[in-house]
Interface confidence: low
């Protein structure tokens, strides 16, 4: 008789989830010298325990401690991207400007990064077949609390002043549900972090408004200035050119607005 | 049990190519790395470079850098060395070791060894 | 590359007796250090593995020191079965590199 399985209304866990995390630990550990500490099993050991035979409902940041001991990582505090929306343009900034660093630049960022995992109570099966949604059934899943802690850590670490890339294309431009919005945010440190820049990206090819107006990105700034870190906002027009002047900089059309 | 087990031995003629594999059983489903190392007769043993098969990335020593080709099917959890323009001082004992250490670059030890297939080139 | 240096190029002991097997690297190696036996018609055999951990069934008479460019293997008390070649290798730095080996020989 096929054992009961709870059905979640989120995917299931991303396939070959084990081998991709270690792969992904092994590759990591190749281009970053100053990770060749880090023991790739014991990595995989600790992120295995954090979610294997829990309820995907009730996860919490302290099951997640052994993987963040592990994974501990130093990165220059004053060189942090942060991003909301706008995964793909922030990756490929810091794959360009090699001195600055997003979340999933880190080792435990690139880990999980697009992955999808959750377990089951009592079991020691991964759940391949579906995993609960953050609005549909919990938001205390595997995933949703993983994100959160090292979300949290890395907004910590900050420093001087930090930046943030936003979709100028989207109707909340600063979401306070983001990630960003509902973590990063609260956990700069007023004592370390001077300023927070936001970088507005924005989508058509003709728009020349200032988002840096847009009410929500008045509502970052009113946030920010209350937690005493000073708030900057710039407009990113021209992404593709903004890309390309961080490659040639010398460029003598890099000269102008972009 | 973990094994490795490697092709028997070859004769091969100066100019031609060899390809020797090494099937892998009861290895744990984890990224591990597969190495190969040659031993001259009365000679010692000399890296030649190393696959890991989750990855598909393979690394060789200069001096073999161009004529030796690592490869693995993962679907088989086979590794296959193919070494080309072979000279008779390529006679030699050629040998898979399991690598473990979860590293690319460095900190790979190898615990678990072929038994050796003996290539030998003679015209 | 890195140079492994071993000495002696042969060692000749008395069952019984300890064995004291240096290796010396070209520039650091951290305790990236493994040691292998070898023994005629064998495929060589890890003993030691991060210049001190003993490999899986790897007897207690058989113990690794140093870290950076200078390493041991001592051997407490040679029994029969322990002669063989020996070698060390590095894998700090790729290419990964032998010493050249020692031989423990009967006295």
């Known amino acids: 008789v096929p054992r009961w399985r709870q059905q979640w209304s989120g995917p299931g866990t991303t396939k070959r989830f084990p081998e991709t995390v270690l792969a992904r630990c092994v590759k990591y550990t190749e281009i970053h010298p100053e990770m060749r500490h880090v023991d790739c099993q014991s990595v995989w050991d600790a992120f295995k325990g954090a979610f294997i035979s829990k309820h995907p409902c009730n996860i919490t940041e302290e099951d997640y401690q052994p993987l963040m001991k592990l994974g501990t990582q130093t990165v220059p505090c004053n060189k942090i991207l942060l991003w909301s929306r706008i995964k793909d343009l922030a990756h490929q900034f810091t794959q360009v400007q090699r001195d600055m660093f997003t979340l999933e630049d880190t080792l435990l960022g690139y880990l999980a990064d697009d992955l999808t995992w959750c377990g089951e109570f009592n079991t020691s099966k991964i759940n391949y077949q579906s995993c609960p949604d953050w609005r549909k059934d919990c938001s205390n899943n595997p995933v949703s609390v993983f994100w959160k802690t090292v979300s949290r850590r890395f907004a910590e670490a900050a420093c001087d002043v930090v930046h943030v890339m936003l979709n100028g294309s989207r109707s909340k431009i600063f979401d306070k549900n983001s990630t960003f919005g509902s973590v990063e945010v609260h956990n700069l440190q007023p004592e370390k972090v001077q300023t927070l820049e936001a970088w507005v990206i924005h989508g058509g090819r003709e728009d020349s408004r200032d988002l840096c107006q847009d009410p929500t990105i008045k509502e970052l700034e009113s946030i920010i200035s209350k937690r005493n870190i000073q708030f900057s906002c710039k407009n990113i027009y021209r992404p593709d050119k903004f890309l390309q002047c961080v490659k040639n900089p010398e460029d003598s059309s890099c000269t102008s607005e972009i | 049990q973990v094994q490795l087990v490697q092709s028997g031995a070859e004769v091969k003629k100066p100019g031609s190519s060899v390809k020797v594999s090494c099937k892998a059983s009861?290895?744990?489903?984890?990224?591990?790395?597969i190495g190969w190392v040659r031993q001259a007769p009365g000679q010692g043993l000399e890296w030649m470079g190393r696959?890991?098969?989750?990855?598909?990335?393979?690394h060789y020593a200069q001096k073999f850098q161009g004529r030796v080709t690592i490869t693995a099917d993962e679907s088989t959890s086979t590794a296959y060395m193919e070494l080309s323009s072979l000279r008779s001082e390529d006679t030699a004992v050629y040998y898979c070791?399991?690598?473990?250490?979860?590293?690319?670059?460095?900190?790979?030890?190898?615990?678990?060894w072929g038994q050796g297939t003996l290539v030998t080139v003679s015209s | 590359e890195i140079v492994m240096t071993q000495s002696p190029a042969t060692l000749s002991v008395s069952p019984g007796e300890r064995a004291t097997l240096s290796c010396r690297a070209s520039q650091s190696v951290s305790s990236n250090l493994a040691w292998y036996q070898q023994k005629p018609g064998q495929a060589p055999r890890l003993l030691i593995y991060?210049?001190?951990t003993r490999a899986t069934g790897i007897p207690a008479r058989f113990s690794g020191s140093g870290s950076g460019t200078e390493f041991t293997l001592t051997i407490s008390s040679l029994q029969s079965e322990d002669f063989a070649v020996y070698y060390c290798q590095q894998y700090n730095n790729w290419p990964w590199t032998f010493g050249q080996g020692t031989k423990v020989e009967i006295k």
């Open positions: 991060g210049a001190s």
């Open positions: 009861g290895l744990p489903d984890a990224t591990y790395a």
């Open positions: 070791a399991r690598g473990l250490g979860y590293y690319l670059y460095s900190s790979y030890y190898f615990d678990i």
């Open positions: 696959i890991i098969p989750v990855l598909d990335a393979a």
